[in-house]
Interface confidence: low
C-alpha cells in the first residue's frame, strides 16, 4: 500500500504563438481545480477506461477574474497535493490523465458549472520511494507543469511497496535471514507470509498465505506469463494454469463499433478505429469540434470549427490514432541492435546496451580484444568498452610492445639510485637510509627504524624490491 502524490506547479499558456484566451472574465469569474486518474502501465490510456489505480480531485483554486486586455497569465492554483492512495503493489509503470477543470462562478441558475479546460495523458516508469519526478505536458495552447512521486505507507517498503518492515525486536540486529529495511535501518524486513512458492518477482501478498499476481502474470504462484503466443485462439478469459487465452466469444462479435468504426481485438478487450469525426470507446461520440479539445496527449487540433466539419488531430511524436489517443510502441520495431534493451521514455527512445556495445542504438561493437593480441605475454582486458592490455613485468604501452623502465617514476627515496633488474627494480640507498625504496632513515647510533635488518644485509646495502 502507498500513496501517489501529484504537485501542480503551474498551468498557463504554453510557449509559441496562439496564446489562449483567459478562461475567466469580469462577467464570468472562475477558479481552477484538477483531477488525476491513474491506471496500471499495461492498461489502455483511452480516457473511457476506469482509473484502476485510483483518482483524486484537488481543492478549488482562488477565484480569478481576468484583467481586460491582459493576456492569460499562469492561473492561480489550488493549495496542496493531489494524493491517490493505492492498496496493492505499486506497478512501476503507470498511465496518468491529468485534467484541468474550470468552475464558473457567474450568475448561473443552479450554482456553479464546470467545463474541462485541458487534459494531458502519458505513460511513465516510476519506482516507489524515489525522488520527485518533474514533467511538462501541453494540451493545445495550454501548458501544465507538475511533479509526482509514489511513496509506500508503513509498514510497506521497496520499489513496489510489497516488502513489509517491522520495528526490530532486538536492538542490535535483525533475525536470521531478515535484512534491515533501507532507509529505515532501525527496522527489519518482516518475514514473508505469502503462500509457499509465490513468485518474489511477480507475486505479492497482503494477507498470510495468499499470492496475488502483478499485471501480466497469472497462476496460483504468479509464475505463468499471460501470453497468447502458445494458444490456438486469442479469445476468452485467461486460464490460470497455462496463461493461455482459451476460446470463447470474441469481443468483436457483432461489431460493437458504431458509426462505421472497425473493430480489432486486443489481448484484453477490443479497440475501435473510428472514422473521422467520431471517437469514443465505440465511436459513439460525434459532432465534436476543436473547441471540445478532442486531441489527446498534446495533439494539435485543426479545422472542425462546427460539428458538420471534421477536425484533424496532428499528433506529437510517439502518439497516433484519430485523436492521438494511442501511444506508438516504438520498441516493437526493435530499434536496439546487438541485444540492447529498448526503453520508451515517452519523450525519447533509449537503448540500454549490453557490455561491449555502445551508440544510440547499440550499433558500435566495442569488443576490441577480438583479433587484437597484447605483445610480450600481455593479456587483453575489456573494461568500460575500451581495450586495455595488462602487460607482463618489464613491458608497458598500449600493446605491451614498449620495454618498461621501472626507474622512470623515480621510486627510490632520499637520493637512492635506481637500477633496472629483470624482476623489477633495485634501489641503492644513500648513506643513512635503508629499505626497499630507501624510505627508512638509519638512526645515528646504528639502530634502524626497522626492528632489524634482514639477515645478510647491512643497513647501507642496496635492497632489491621484489
Amino acid at each position: 500500500a502507498g500513496v501517489f502524490e501529484l504537485q501542480i506547479h503551474s498551468f498557463g499558456p504554453g510557449p509559441g504563438p496562439g496564446a489562449p484566451r483567459s478562461p475567466c472574465s469580469a462577467r464570468l469569474p472562475c477558479r481552477l481545480f484538477f483531477r488525476v486518474c491513474l491506471k496500471p502501465g499495461l492498461s489502455e490510456e483511452a480516457a473511457e477506461s476506469p482509473c484502476a489505480l485510483g483518482a483524486a480531485l484537488s481543492a478549488r483554486g482562488p477565484v480569478y477574474t481576468e484583467q481586460p486586455g491582459a493576456p492569460a497569465p499562469d492561473l492561480p492554483l489550488p493549495d496542496g497535493l493531489l494524493q491517490v492512495p493505492f492498496r496493492d503493489a505499486w506497478p512501476g509503470t503507470f498511465s496518468f490523465i491529468i485534467e484541468t477543470w474550470r468552475e464558473e462562478l457567474g450568475d448561473q441558475i443552479g450554482g456553479p458549472a464546470w467545463s474541462l479546460l485541458a487534459r494531458v495523458a502519458g505513460r511513465r516508469r516510476l519506482a516507489a520511494g524515489g525522488p520527485w519526478a518533474r514533467d511538462i505536458q501541453r494540451a493545445g495552447a495550454w501548458e501544465l507543469r507538475f511533479s509526482y512521486r509514489a511513496r509506500c505507507e508503513p509498514p510497506a517498503v521497496g520499489t513496489a511497496c510489497t516488502r513489509l518492515c517491522r520495528p526490530r525486536s532486538a536492538p542490535s540486529r535483525c533475525g536470521p535471514g531478515l535484512r534491515p529495511c533501507a532507509p529505515l535501518e532501525d527496522e527489519c524486513e518482516a518475514p514473508l507470509v505469502c503462500r509457499a512458492g509465490c513468485s518474489p518477482e511477480h507475486g505479492f501478498c497482503e494477507q498470510p498465505g495468499e499470492c496475488r499476481c502483478l499485471e501480466g502474470w497469472t497462476g496460483p504462484l504468479c509464475t505463468v506469463p499471460v501470453s497468447t503466443s502458445s494458444c490456438l485462439s486469442p479469445r476468452g478469459p485467461s486460464s490460470a494454469t497455462t496463461g493461455c487465452l482459451v476460446p470463447g466469444p470474441g469481443p468483436c462479435d457483432g461489431n460493437p463499433c458504431a458509426n462505421g468504426g472497425s473493430c480489432s481485438e486486443t489481448p484484453r478487450s477490443f479497440e475501435c478505429t473510428c472514422p473521422r469525426g467520431f471517437y469514443g470507446l465505440r465511436c459513439e461520440v460525434s459532432g465534436v469540434t476543436c473547441a471540445d479539445g478532442p486531441c489527446f496527449n498534446g495533439g494539435l487540433c485543426v479545422g472542425g470549427a462546427d460539428p458538420d466539419s471534421a477536425y484533424i488531430c496532428h499528433c506529437p511524436p510517439g502518439f497516433q490514432g484519430s485523436n492521438c489517443e494511442k501511444r506508438v510502441d516504438r520498441c516493437s520495431l526493435q530499434p536496439c541492435r546487438n541485444g540492447g534493451l529498448c526503453l520508451d521514455l515517452g519523450h525519447a527512445l533509449r537503448c540500454r546496451c549490453r557490455a561491449g556495445f555502445a551508440g544510440p542504438r547499440c550499433e558500435h561493437d566495442l569488443d576490441d580484444c577480438a583479433g587484437r593480441a597484447c605483445a610480450n605475454g600481455g593479456t587483453c582486458v575489456e573494461g568500460g568498452g575500451a581495450h586495455r592490455c595488462s602487460c607482463a613485468l618489464g613491458f608497458g604501452g598500449r600493446d605491451c610492445r614498449e620495454r618498461a623502465d621501472p626507474c622512470a617514476a623515480r621510486p627510490c627515496a632520499h637520493g637512492g639510485r635506481c637500477y633496472a633488474h629483470f624482476s623489477g627494480l633495485v634501489c641503492a640507498c644513500a648513506p643513512g637510509y635503508m629499505g626497499a625504496r630507501c624510505e627508512f632513515p638509519v638512526h645515528p647510533d646504528g639502530a634502524s627504524a626497522l626492528p632489524a635488518a634482514p639477515p645478510g644485509l647491512r643497513p647501507g646495502d642496496p635492497q632489491r624490491y621484489l
Epitope: 480516457a47 458549472a113 464546470w114 467545463s115 469514443g280 459513439e284
Partner: nanobody
Framework: QVQLVESGGGLVQPGGSLRLSCAAS????????VNWYRQAPGQEREKVAR????????NYANSAKGRFTISRDNSKNTLYLQMNSLRAEDTAVYYC?????????WGQGTLVTVSS
C-alpha cells in the same frame, strides 16, 4: 446507478411542436456535454444537437437548425429539446447521450412520430 430517461415523445401533426426531456441521475451531469441523437427506421443514428457542460455553447445539425432548441438545467440534472415546425422526416426514436472525456452514457430513447 447511472440513468438517462427520455420523455415527451408522441404523435404530432406536421408543423406541430414537442418538448423532449432527459432526466439524468447517478453521475455528475453538470460536467458532461450532452447531445440529442435520433434514429429513423432503417437509418443510421444521427446527432441532432449538442450543448456544452456549462450550457454556453450549442451546435445543431443542418436538419435541425432554426427549428430545434437544445437547453439544459444543471440544477435539475435535465436536458431539453424544443422541437418546432415538425416534419414527417423528423419521425424517429430520439436518444439523449451524455459525453465526457472519460465516459459516455445513453438513454433508452423516446419515439416521436410526425404524421397527419
Amino acid at each position: 446507478q447511472v440513468q438517462l430517461v427520455e420523455s415527451g415523445g408522441g404523435l404530432v401533426q406536421p408543423g406541430g411542436s414537442l418538448r423532449l426531456s432527459c432526466a439524468a441521475s447517478g453521475f455528475d451531469f453538470s460536467t458532461y456535454t450532452v447531445n440529442w441523437y435520433r434514429q429513423a427506421p432503417g437509418q443510421e443514428r444521427e446527432k441532432v444537437a449538442r450543448i456544452s457542460s456549462t450550457g454556453t455553447t450549442t451546435n445543431y445539425a443542418n436538419s435541425a437548425k432554426g427549428r430545434f432548441t437544445i437547453s439544459r438545467d444543471n440544477s435539475k440534472n435535465t436536458l431539453y429539446l424544443q422541437m418546432n415546425s415538425l416534419r414527417a422526416e423528423d419521425t424517429a426514436v430520439y436518444y439523449c447521450a451524455a459525453e465526457r472525456f472519460d465516459s459516455n452514457y445513453w438513454g433508452q430513447g423516446t419515439l416521436v412520430t410526425v404524421s397527419s
